[in-house]
């Protein structure tokens, strides 16, 4: 299959991404134009036949003029200017602004909390399995296996710090060498980028928003994958990371430091610990082949325990088994010795929802996974809505200019590096690259930050998370200090190497181009985003894991042909776009391949069949609910079903469908307001600024 089906060159030529009559959504739908329109006073639109649904959202207006889909939308202000307001209006506007700010911070807080709980949920569902991945002895000899274990474990526990800490404890207890740990760390770096990709999926409702959000999230993925693609073979061949970090660790006499400051956790922990608390040591114990840990629950039951260290007398088979000759005696029949025993006495139970349920980890994990995804989705929608209403006119202009504008010549090149520092700093503050990049995703989606600017911020985030790890390493106890510091430094230098590869020269900023390409495909075929997520974060790592277990011969036997085909396709693709004349006529395009191998159209038809069935059920349910609601409140226009349902109804009736504006998943009242069903006075209270 061609790597980017139906895409020509990487240049942003929107014509290439259009299919049928329903083309690209104008990136910046002019909201002011829509505000007071009713359904029957629609601007002229191209009447088309309803195409197979590409996702759960409807298709949108045909653009009158085709824009670059990557241009940032101009969020125009529909409200009254500040100067034109009376005192009452100004006071009202001020309090509205304060209210919005409080709401924004509130939703942001729950967004971060839901990320934390999502991580806990993943650990409950797949934590023990993740721990068992580590207990595989082949990691030592197979760097590729180490890499995929790093990816899988981090994806399963949704936390690179958890997987890294397992690696550290394994290295410090000599179960793993630093050399074997490096590929796992690289894998953990890849695995941690899944979180913001999941967050981007939440913005699937609006095509252009999703294009930007998904590309902005996957730029992180591509950076990590490409870095590994280049640096893992280099590391295997030269062991440069191991050597450099060893020199650093040996040349400094590090004293145990303080713990990395938990800044964000201080605010979120009081809430998240009321939902669930986990005993993360269990995963580490499983990784270290502790048989007892396999039966332990990850859900923490006792939060206050009293640990009493006492010496007890125990019988031993012979004096050779004594702890020391001086601590050895007999009672005349048996030999005795003194042993240090730690008694753990449970004092107080934890105060979280699941403490008294005694449910299996999988059940708790599933419940939390669903709930956290719902909260995450809800918070994200609300954040986007609030930001959308705040970032209009002057405010948007100022913010966009501040974030996306470069320094004046000749210092323009420095802007990106400053962004890297900002990303690192912000990640250090929030103590999590996942949180930072996930918070960045909706901002990219709504068009506040360009992908070009998000890229260095993301790279900085990668650095920031490693500085946190270095601080944590310096705070670790004596025996673990060296190994944890060396691993943290490996992580740091890996990311530095990646930045040197894929950032300084604009030409080498491949992740941006790849992410944009994926963004275009995913905006058109939204199911492809989920497909990408499953393939890259689960299927490929699991396949490599399975083949590695089968042995080197099998891995090479399957891997070499696959790699060869990929290289062949890439070379052919490069020649097709750069110098097609070199190639024979047949190879100048992909038409020689069957349609299913070069286009996503046939696949889309299959997916549409499945999703269409689900969509019909969903809409029927929606319609029933709406009608019940309307009957109760005795108002014919009180409730409207989602746009997709109307389209489906009309399609069933065999009518031509005028494709509407992107209000698909918006709040009912807001969508009605946009279509002029709500009195215009409602929108007059809109504030332009906080």
């Amino acid at each position: 299959m061609a790597p980017w089906p139906e895409l020509g060159d990487a240049q942003p030529n929107p014509d290439k991404y259009l299919e049928g009559a329903a083309g690209q959504q104008p990136t910046a739908p002019d909201k002011s134009k829509e505000t007071n329109k009713t359904d029957n006073t629609e601007a002229p639109v191209t009447k088309i036949e309803l195409l197979p649904s590409y996702s759960t959202a409807t298709l949108i207006d045909e653009p009158t003029e085709v824009d670059d889909p990557w241009n940032l939308p101009t969020l125009q202000d529909s409200g009254i200017k500040w100067s034109e307001r009376d005192t009452k209006g100004k006071i009202l506007c001020f309090f509205q602004g304060i209210g919005r700010l409080i709401l924004l911070l509130g939703f942001l807080y729950f967004f971060v909390c839901s990320l934390d709980i999502l991580s806990s949920a993943f650990q409950l569902v797949g934590g023990k399995m993740a721990g068992q991945f580590f207990s595989n002895s082949s990691i030592m000899s197979n760097p590729l296996l180490g890499l995929v274990i790093g990816v899988l474990v981090t994806v399963l526990v949704q936390s690179s710090s958890t997987s890294t800490s397992i690696v550290v404890s394994m290295v410090s207890s000599s179960l793993l060498t630093v050399r074997a740990a490096i590929p796992i760390i690289m894998g953990a770096n890849i695995g941690t980028s899944i979180t913001n990709t999941i967050v981007a999926l939440m913005q699937v409702g609006d095509r252009s928003e999703f294009r930007r959000a998904f590309a902005g999230a996957t730029v992180h993925d591509f950076f990590n994958w490409l870095s590994v693609l280049v640096l893992l073979p280099v590391e295997v061949a030269t062991h440069y990371l191991e050597i450099i970090t060893q020199l650093i660790v040996e040349s400094f006499h590090f004293k145990n430091g303080e713990d990395a400051p938990d800044l964000l956790k201080v605010i979120t922990k009081p809430f998240t610990k009321l939902i669930v608390q986990l005993d993360k040591k269990v995963i580490s114990q499983i990784a270290m082949n502790d048989e007892k840990a396999k039966n332990k629950s990850l859900v923490k039951i006792w939060c206050k325990t009293f640990t009493n260290k006492t010496q007890i007398n125990v019988t031993v088979p012979s004096t050779a088994n004594c702890t020391s000759p001086s601590l050895c005696w007999t009672d005349g029949i048996q030999n005795w010795t003194m042993k240090n025993v730690t008694y753990k006495e449970n004092i107080a139970k934890c105060q979280h929802i699941f403490v008294n349920f005694h449910l299996p980890d999988l059940a708790v994990g599933t419940i939390l996974l669903i709930l956290s995804l719902l909260v995450l989705c809800g918070c994200l929608i609300m954040i986007v809505k609030i930001l959308g209403s705040v970032l209009k006119g002057q405010v948007a202009t100022v913010i966009k200019k501040t974030i996306n504008t470069d320094f004046p010549f000749p210092f323009a090149w420095l802007t990106g590096y400053l962004a890297i520092l900002v990303g690192a700093g912000m990640t250090f503050i929030v103590q999590s690259s996942s949180v930072f990049t996930s918070a960045l995703t909706p901002l990219i989606g709504i068009g506040v930050i360009t992908i070009e600017r998000a890229y260095p911020l993301t790279l900085g985030s990668n650095i920031g998370t490693t500085t946190t790890a270095i601080l944590a390493a310096l705070a670790s106890p004596g025996n673990a200090l060296r190994s944890s510091l060396q691993i943290a430094l490996c992580h740091f230098f890996f990311n530095i190497s990646g930045i040197l590869l894929w950032y300084p020269i604009p030409f080498t900023r491949l992740p941006i181009r790849m992410a944009k390409g994926l963004g275009n495909i995913s905006a058109k075929y939204r199911w492809f985003a989920v497909f990408y997520l499953i393939i890259f974060f689960f299927l490929i790592p699991l396949t490599v894991f399975g083949l590695s277990l089968a042995g080197w011969r099998v891995l090479v036997g399957v891997g070499v042909p696959v790699v060869f085909i990929i290289i062949l396709v890439l070379c052919l693709r490069l020649l097709q776009s750069r110098c097609p004349r070199v190639l024979p006529k047949k190879l100048q395009n992909w038409n020689f391949l069957p349609l299913w191998m070069r286009s996503l159209k046939p696949w889309d038809a299959v997916v549409s069949k499945f999703t269409g069935c689900f969509q019909m059920r969903c809409c029927c349910c929606c319609r029933v609910c709406c009608r019940a609601c309307c009957l109760l409140c005795d108002c014919p226009k009180c409730c409207r079903c989602s746009k997709c349902c109307e389209d489906l109804e009309e399609a069933q009736e065999g009518q031509d469908v005028p494709v509407k504006a992107p209000e698909t998943f918006d709040n009912i009242t807001i969508s009605r307001e946009a279509q002029g069903e709500v009195p215009a006075s409602d929108s007059k209270t809109e504030c332009t600024a906080l």
Epitope: N313, T319, P325, S326, L327, C328, W329, T330, D331, G332, I333, Q334, N335, W336
Partner: antibody, heavy 119, light 107 residues
Framework: QVQLVQSGAEVVKPGASVKVSCKTS????????MHWVRQAPGQGLEWIGA????????AYNQKFKGRVTLTADKSTSTAYMELSSLRSEATAVYYC????????????WGQGTLVTVSS | DIQLTQSPSFLSASVGDRVTITCKAS??????VAWYQQKPGKAPKLLIY???TRHSGVPSRFSGSGSGTEFTLTISSLQPEDFATYYC?????????FGQGTKLEIK
């Protein structure tokens, strides 16, 4: 209170056997070892062996092995020491002593049984 | 077997005197040492175990010290009832062994 009461003095001929008993009370018989110690006239103390009445496990001093058999009857909380193939140098006071749990110190002793071997 | 050597074998002292009896082991026995008091015609009586721990009912004037190979029993102020023979015993390994005894007499 803990009490260990031993059987009375015995006079035996050389080559014969003798069984000395030690009846206990005031504690759980099966939880502590029972040691046997001998003291020849005007001499020091010498450990013969010990039995754990709970399981019947025994340990002997090599010097006495084969000539001493230690047994215990849980039903009567009584420990026994049988001395066989007696010689004149076996003449001594034989003590039973309760071992402290978990180590070899002896906290309670019987009054002693004098065994005299003479023809 | 571990040999225990007590010194002195005989000791004359007066009431109120401070008396020290030593016991040397042929090898390291840790603190697995006990001290007994035996009066003529009677069974031995446990005074000290674990080299330093006084058995219940034993007067505080009796104290034990030492570890490894050298141990001492100290009577801080001799009383008339303290005149007897004193034995040390090791229970570090089988067979359990006793010292030859120290006879404490009235001066």
């Amino acid at each position: 209170q803990v009490q260990l009461v031993q059987s009375g003095a015995e006079v035996v001929k050389p080559g014969a056997s003798v069984k000395v008993s030690c009846k206990t009370s005031g504690y759980t018989f099966t939880t502590n070892n029972m040691h046997w110690v001998r003291q020849a006239p005007g001499q020091g103390l010498e450990w013969i062996g010990a039995i754990y009445p709970g399981s019947g496990a025994t340990a002997y001093n090599q010097k006495f092995k084969g000539r001493v058999t230690l047994t215990a009857d849980k039903s009567t909380s009584t420990a026994y020491m049988e001395l066989s193939s007696l010689r004149s140098e076996a003449t001594a006071v034989y003590y039973c002593a309760r071992g402290m749990y978990g180590h070899g110190a002896m906290d309670y002793w019987g009054q002693g049984t004098l065994v005299t071997v003479s023809s | 077997d571990i040999q225990l050597t007590q010194s002195p074998s005989f000791l004359s002292a007066s009431v109120g005197d401070r008396v020290t009896i030593t016991c040397k082991a042929s090898q390291d026995v840790g603190t697995a040492v006990a001290w007994y008091q035996q009066k003529p015609g009677k069974a031995p009586k446990l005074l000290i175990y674990w080299a330093t721990t006084r058995h219940s009912g034993v007067p505080s004037r009796f104290s034990g010290s030492g570890s490894g190979t050298e141990f001492t029993l100290t009577i801080s102020s001799l009383q008339p009832e303290d005149f007897a023979t004193y034995y040390c015993q090791q229970y570090s390994s089988n067979p359990l062994t006793f010292g030859q005894g120290t006879k404490l007499e009235i001066k």
